[in-house]
Amino acid sequence: QDCSAQCQCAAEAAPHCPAGVSLVLDGCGCCRVCAKQLGELCTERDPCDPHKGLFCDFGSPANRKIGVCTAKDGAPCVFGGSVYRSGESFQSSCKYQCTCLDGAVGCVPLCSMDVRLPSPDCPFPRRVKLPGKCCEEWVCDEPKDRTAVGPALAAYRLEDTFGPDPTMMRANCLVQTTEWSACSKTCGMGISTRVTNDNTFCRLEKQSRLCMVRPCEADLEENIKKGKKCIRTPKIAKPVKFELSGCTSVKTYRAKFCGVCTDGRCCTPHRTTTLPVEFKCPDGEIMKKNMMFIKTCACHYNCPGDNDIFESLYYRKMYGDMAHHHHHH
């Protein structure tokens, strides 16, 4: 670099350098410039930051005009307003462990950068910052209607939510529908619910249907054949009429119910469908209600515990009529 020419500085006032960057005289001792940092290109006129132990490495003698700012062995590091010795490790925050090495800072994340793909156990995974925790943690979203954990869940587990089905995308509406919840009663007439936005205005609404896993009065254990321990789907001898608050179904139904086991297993609906049922009341009023009809049942050891209904049953779905939910509301 030729320094014989008269000093000519770009500006009369000293430049304003970013935080942590030194203001130094150029290689000719003429003008004050912002020092080049580690890895940046440098010249005689644009020197490297001497306070960080940097020098302009011009490489082979053939190229003496432009170099790269390189740290001298053992050069310290300036990071976040602090100076660290070469070889020194420090935590820049609770999320990163950093090391200074010859003027360069390298950091590794202390928090897992892991991903989580949806599964039956966690249909809507997302990372959230939890109070008192440094690292974000995975949480598994559930429908907003699931905040109340009451008797409606006594029979089986809560149902998980489906991920969005690409085939159900509408203009400006991502159609999402939860599975039907488990029946609120282990025997007799109960209620099963789900949440959907599959409607004209894409509004979240709660749908309900009547359900009967098994009649309360039936002594199903008597029907278990000798040597067997379970009766999964007992045959109902005669068609039945359903009763609801003093009203009786207009038609009779040869419905399937779930059986019982004598070996500690429980039997729950596995595949179901939803159909409208008309009820006639004593005052002559006719009301139409959607009702769950069981196609198949499953017998399993994952029965609800006395203390935690989530523990063993949280994952057992009532494998219902999801695929057709938009055809019969």
Epitope: S112, L117, G163, E311, Y315
Partner: antibody, heavy 114, light 110 residues
Framework: EVTLKESGPVLVKPTETLTLTCTVS????????VHWIRQPPGKALEWLAV???????DYNAAFMSRLTISKDTSKSQVVLTMTNMDPVDTATYYC????????WGQGTTVTVSS | ETVVTQEPSLTVSPGGTVTLTCRSS?????????ANWVQQKPGQAFRGLIG???NRAPWTPARFSGSLLGGKAALTLSGVQPEDEAEYYC?????????FGGGTKLTVLG
């Protein structure tokens, strides 16, 4: 870094009980479930069991009476026991993380022979 | 017993497109089956490519896509690379258990 490593006996006699351990690192068993899968020589994968993040379990119905899956979250270990082993149970046994079966162990080969 | 069926083998030329399917014996595959696709390259460990029907793992290239196609789960590879030659397994969730398919051996010519 997420890793899963299976350990257990290489050779088991017929009628004996097989106990396999899956030791995980890089994630917590309270956040992710773990599955056991096996592959008999020259055959397809066969799902055996899962223990979910909250401790619930599910099993392949064909093996339900023979399988038990449990976990020790503090030790980051999942244990699978399979009773009444038979030569047809000769296979490579794998554990895999829930969530797309994204991470798998290298597998442990178990031979059932007298 | 529920059976999950895959094409035993498929062959594709580099740069081509191929679709692997996963059929359930008890009806159409839906999002509630949380279709998963797992890859095993020769001499390597298994690793998940797709979970929850269509969600890619971070290491899964964009040329791999998961979907539902005609009542089946599908894994489509567009612009196939030689390194995509592998065994591919699908797994479907049935309310209480998973079932794996028999696997598809994908051969990339050339």
């Amino acid at each position: 870094e997420v890793t899963l490593k299976e350990s257990g006996p290489v050779l088991v006699k017929p009628t004996e009980t097989l106990t396999l351990t899956c030791t995980v690192s890089g994630f917590s068993l309270s956040t992710f479930g773990v599955h056991w899968i096996r592959q008999p020589p020259g055959k397809a994968l066969e799902w055996l069991a899962v223990i979910w993040r909250r401790g619930g379990t599910d099993y392949n119905a064909a093996f339900m009476s023979r399988l038990t899956i449990s976990k020790d979250t503090s030790k980051s270990q999942v244990v699978l026991t399979m009773t009444n082993m038979d030569p047809v149970d000769t296979a490579t046994y794998y554990c895999a993380r829930d969530g797309g079966f994204d991470y798998w162990g290298q597998g442990t080969t178990v031979t059932v022979s007298s | 017993e529920t059976v999950v069926t895959q094409e035993p083998s498929l062959t594709v030329s580099p740069g081509g497109t191929v679709t692997l399917t996963c059929r359930s014996s008890i009806g159409a595959v839906t999002t509630s089956n949380y279709a998963n696709w797992v890859q095993q390259k020769p001499g390597q460990a298994f690793r998940g490519l797709i979970g929850g029907t269509s969600n890619r793992a971070p290491w899964t290239p964009a040329r791999f896509s998961g979907s539902l196609l005609g009542g089946k789960a599908a894994l489509t590879l567009s612009g196939v690379q030689p390194e995509d030659e592998a065994e591919y397994y699908c797994a479907l969730w049935y309310s209480t258990h998973y079932v794996f398919g028999g696997g598809t051996k994908l051969t990339v010519l050339g």
